[in-house]
């Protein structure tokens, strides 16, 4: 058993038919020492008197919360959640698994720039009764500062019969280096709470391999005179990092027919503009990456030919 | 001393309204998670609705949807709970609550501030 938080207790049980569970001591957080007695949850059963209280703690329903009373008045509570492991592993009821970029992925991370800053999200199919607190530092055994915001509910979506909800938080490590060779990975820690359920995900990276710079802005055509040629051009995404000429980008150009059967020319280059045909009823698209780094293309920014 | 204490509670009919609010003191109420929570006779508790730090982000349970509606003014370190269309099932003591992460938990002890409640009655 350990501390969540104040007055939240983590019982850490083998999950297994006729698991002898853990035996647990919860103490009465007052000076009296008489007249005590102890009930769970709404229940006004008296479970017991005493300024302890000790439990065999083996199913959900020896979980929550607990409070010592004196006469009618309220002395003190602790909550008891459970983490459950079966077969050696912890369970992963409460995320669902991404399986991008690999299986048992549950928390996904993207960073715009090398500022330090990144958003991570997950998914779930549970709708109330949900808690998630994150921590992050750089590092785990002399860890950097990192500090992430609440999380939020950031999307709903419908996947046949379910509902899918995305949560997303923002973190910022403190004292960032964007030009510096990273050596420490980021360590992401979501705490998950559902009802008296708790369970643990984390995640490891680095900044340059969660890099996705945002599309390219300013995207704009120019027909080149007596041709079917256009020179398209486009601009640096404001959130890329600076200068540009040390943290610098390469593009894809894309010249994309109606139909997605039809042929893509792709021309790649490391300026902000290139000389493509642009066939009739065609689009034209581009994408960044970072030119020394392969991680993430951006998302496509597009304009039709016509 | 860090307290939340919830006003604004009393004796509606079916179908009106009523504003609750819940003032901070001891701590700023921009840097945490609010939620009401509330709890019927002899029921136990139920999350009612939630709102983020800066007030960009609103959550209610589904009952709730559309006829309440939470807001913040960390100005005045005051939450609000306008509730319009109510009903009989809306008799409760709804509490204010305080958490510096996400959560629409009904446990006391995982917020990290909760109020004394106010009484809210639903009847004609």
């Known amino acids: 058993i350990w501390e969540l938080k104040k007055d939240v207790y983590v019982v850490e049980l083998d999950w297994y038919p006729d698991a002898p569970g853990e035996m647990v001591v919860l103490t009465c957080d007052t000076p009296e020492e008489d007249g005590i007695t102890w009930t769970l949850d709404q229940s006004s059963e008296v479970l017991g008197s005493g300024k302890t209280l000790t439990i065999q703690v083996k199913e959900f329903g020896d979980a929550g919360q607990y409070t010592c009373h004196k006469g009618g008045e309220v002395l003190s509570h602790s909550l008891l959640l459970l983490h459950k492991k079966e077969d050696g592993i912890w369970s992963t009821d409460i995320l669902k698994d991404q399986k991008e970029p690999k299986n048992k992925t549950f928390l996904r991370c993207e960073a715009k720039n090398y500022s330090g800053r990144f958003t991570c999200w997950w998914l779930t199919t549970i709708s109330t009764d949900l808690t998630f607190s994150v921590k992050s530092s750089r590092g785990s055994s002399d860890p950097q500062g990192v500090t992430c915001g609440a999380a939020t509910l950031s999307a709903e979506r419908v996947r046949g019969d379910n509902k899918e909800y995305e949560y997303s938080v923002e973190c910022q490590e403190d004292s960032a280096c964007p030009a510096a060779e990273e050596s420490l990975p980021i360590e992401v820690m979501v705490d998950a709470v559902h009802k008296l359920k708790y369970e643990n995900y984390t995640s490891s990276f680095f900044i340059r391999d969660i890099i996705k710079p945002d599309p390219p802005k300013n995207l704009q055509l120019k027909p080149l005179k007596n041709s079917r040629q256009v020179e398209v051009s486009w601009e640096y995404p404001d959130t890329w990092s600076t200068p540009h000429s040390y943290f610098s980008l390469t593009f894809c150009v894309q010249v994309q027919g109606k139909s997605k059967r039809e042929k893509k020319d792709r021309v790649f280059t490391d300026k902000t503009s290139a000389t493509v045909i642009c066939r009739k009823n065609a689009s034209i698209s581009v994408r960044a990456q970072d030119r020394y780094y392969s991680s993430s293309w951006s998302e496509w920014a597009s304009v039709p030919c016509s | 001393e860090v307290q939340l204490v919830e006003s604004g509670g009393g004796l509606v009919q079916p179908g009106g309204s009523l504003r609750l609010s819940c003032a901070a003191s001891?701590?700023?109420?921009?840097?945490?998670?609010m939620s009401w929570v509330r709890q019927a006779p002899g029921k136990g508790l139920e999350w009612v609705s939630s709102?983020?730090?800066?007030?960009?982000?609103?959550y209610y349970a589904g009952s709730m949807k559309g006829r309440f509606t939470i807001s913040r003014d960390n100005a005045k370190n005051t939450l609000y709970l306008q509730m319009s269309s109510l009903k009989p099932e809306d008799t409760a003591v709804y509490y204010c609550?305080?958490?510096?992460?996400?959560?629409?938990?009904?446990?006391?002890?995982?917020?990290?501030?909760w109020g004394q409640g106010t009484q809210v009655t639903v009847s004609s």
């Open positions: 609550a305080a958490a510096t992460f996400y959560t629409t938990s009904t446990y006391i002890s995982l917020y990290d501030y």
């Open positions: 709102i983020s730090r800066d007030g960009g982000r609103t």
């Open positions: 001891g701590f700023t109420l921009d840097d945490y998670t």
